[in-house]
Interface confidence: low
Amino acid sequence: RGVFRRDAHKSEVAHRFKDLGEENFKALVLIAFAQYLQQCPFEDHVKLVNEVTEFAKTCVADESAENCDKSLHTLFGDKLCTVATLRETYGEMADCCAKQEPERNECFLQHKDDNPNLPRLVRPEVDVMCTAFHDNEETFLKKYLYEIARRHPYFYAPELLFFAKRYKAAFTECCQAADKAACLLPKLDELRDEGKASSAKQRLKCASLQKFGERAFKAWAVARLSQRFPKAEFAEVSKLVTDLTKVHTECCHGDLLECADDRADLAKYICENQDSISSKLKECCEKPLLEKSHCIAEVENDEMPADLPSLAADFVESKDVCKNYAEAKDVFLGMFLYEYARRHPDYSVVLLLRLAKTYETTLEKCCAAADPHECYAKVFDEFKPLVEEPQNLIKQNCELFEQLGEYKFQNALLVRYTKKVPQVSTPTLVEVSRNLGKVGSKCCKHPEAKRMPCAEDYLSVVLNQLCVLHEKTPVSDRVTKCCTESLVNRRPCFSALEVDETYVPKEFNAETFTFHADICTLSEKERQIKKQTALVELVKHKPKATKEQLKAVMDDFAAFVEKCCKADDKETCFAEEGKKLVAASQAALGL
């Protein structure tokens, strides 16, 4: 029943063009190119895409035509290597072009930049956007794909097509509405926020595959799909995991045409076999392709089958545990993970993987012992502290969030994480801590049974952002250690870090704490970021400052900004009052 068994094709490019259709083919090639060459101007990419598309059409007409038998990596790599400014724009990345496939593609992948030096996207006036949309809809939408793809080089390409479809629908609907802005802006905000979340989730999948291997990704997928489809048989879940792993391996490897094609096949398979997978798929399967795939990926967990037997019978009490384990270790562990996960939609995926790891370690030890059964009889008791640790952490942090609200909760995390890893750059600490803080409003509203999967799996995504940003410029051994030792223990590793006693405080620099009248025109979010940046810098100067000291300085700072923004001569106020604030802060913190 393999979804991806295909006949060999004389021309891979023709095959994908026919499967995907011209519109999706062009969009996916544009995404692929923009994710590789993140600094190239839009017009250059469009030109390359048009050339590839024209070539693909010649291959559709005659699969035996010259070069049509070449692999997609060869065709796309050759095209990227024609860019004249490759050396001056990308430096050593140009050396990739001297390599042969598959090394050349691997080289391009290694040069993807998670934090490219690109200007922030500024949203034009609604009327300007609507005019641009009406003047040239095709270019307008291509530009959206290009701008997102180059800033998010691991964005899940078929999902970006879904975002682009919603983006187009928003403009088509709202540019004809009576109040264009009221219609459009909330939709664009929603797309932006969902897009950032989607990008971060996919980045974790790619990191899992690239840094920890296929086995780690498959384990994650077994746990998640077993929670989502608890009525499905183990063989069915295994088949879905195999196919899903292929899809994500392709997308993370830059094989976007194959990835989108295979994702469509997987959605088709799931919908054709929904009776043996989940009762929750009916609505998803009635939707058009892009919406269908998205809907399946987000579908709620099916109800657990009634009267599931105790796990202990097969995995602890049975005399055949070591025999079954020895015969096929990964299959047996996969079955354990499947059975545990389908019974525990209330656990995070990472917790389930920790339990499976503990079970595996116990069997490795006990199946070599004199009395294996006696040795592993109490293995489930070892799970208790592993389950309680995230439960307690979430309870404490949700209480703190409810007491402080999101902004102050973020500030508490900023202080906590700056003290743990003060070497990390201030923008990264601010970005990561703000995102960590969003776990409160995202997850604490849920009932107990949904809190842990929401919170801990979200934290895994956010901490992966820290890991990929830190990998680009490593500055902290502690971050490297937590990021590389174990994928599923990243969050407990960071939680366990205490204040870094080896850190030498940063020299005080008054310029860091000098503010100007431009802060008054910023949005509330941007103003918060300014204040949080100052807070991180304070902690870097005075890592031993108490909560009370920091709170007093931050309260003074907020009052200072409010006062000067109301002043007639704002700039003078910021200059004069700013000096007083810096002096008072230094005194308060003993700097």
Epitope: E173, Q176, A177, A178, K287
Partner: nanobody
């Protein structure tokens, strides 16, 4: 410029029928799901029915199920709503919209059901 022009409304007795049309222009009609929305006097807009881009998938509000039928002709860029067994509570201005939105960008067509 996106344009949606509804027609076919009018005064009809309870139990009667009407067929509404919506002519679309200025966008790729065949690529979008479409909806009918209505607004009764003094009330907010109410979603009535939707159809996907190809015309295969149709959905209806409970209040009109079994009485109204939505359809489309992509070649003519036109959306239709066949309304049978009309009731006084169906009295409203009917609008067609892109997607399943209830935000209006057109004039609509008045349907009045009264004896």
């Amino acid at each position: 410029q996106v344009q949606l022009v509804e027609s076919g409304g009018g005064l009809v007795q309870p139990g009667g029928s009407l067929r509404l049309s919506c002519a679309a222009s200025g966008f790729t009609f065949g690529s979008f799901g479409m909806s009918w929305v209505r607004q009764a006097p003094g009330k907010g807009p109410e979603w009535v029915s939707a159809i996907d881009s190809g015309g295969a998938d149709t959905r209806y509000a409970e209040s009109v199920k079994g009485r109204f039928t939505i359809s489309r002709d992509n070649a003519k860029k036109t959306l239709y709503l066949q309304m049978n067994s009309l009731k006084p509570e169906d009295t409203a201005v009917y609008y067609c919209t892109i997607g399943q939105s209830t935000s209006r960008g057109s004039q609509g067509t008045q349907v009045t059901v009264s004896s």
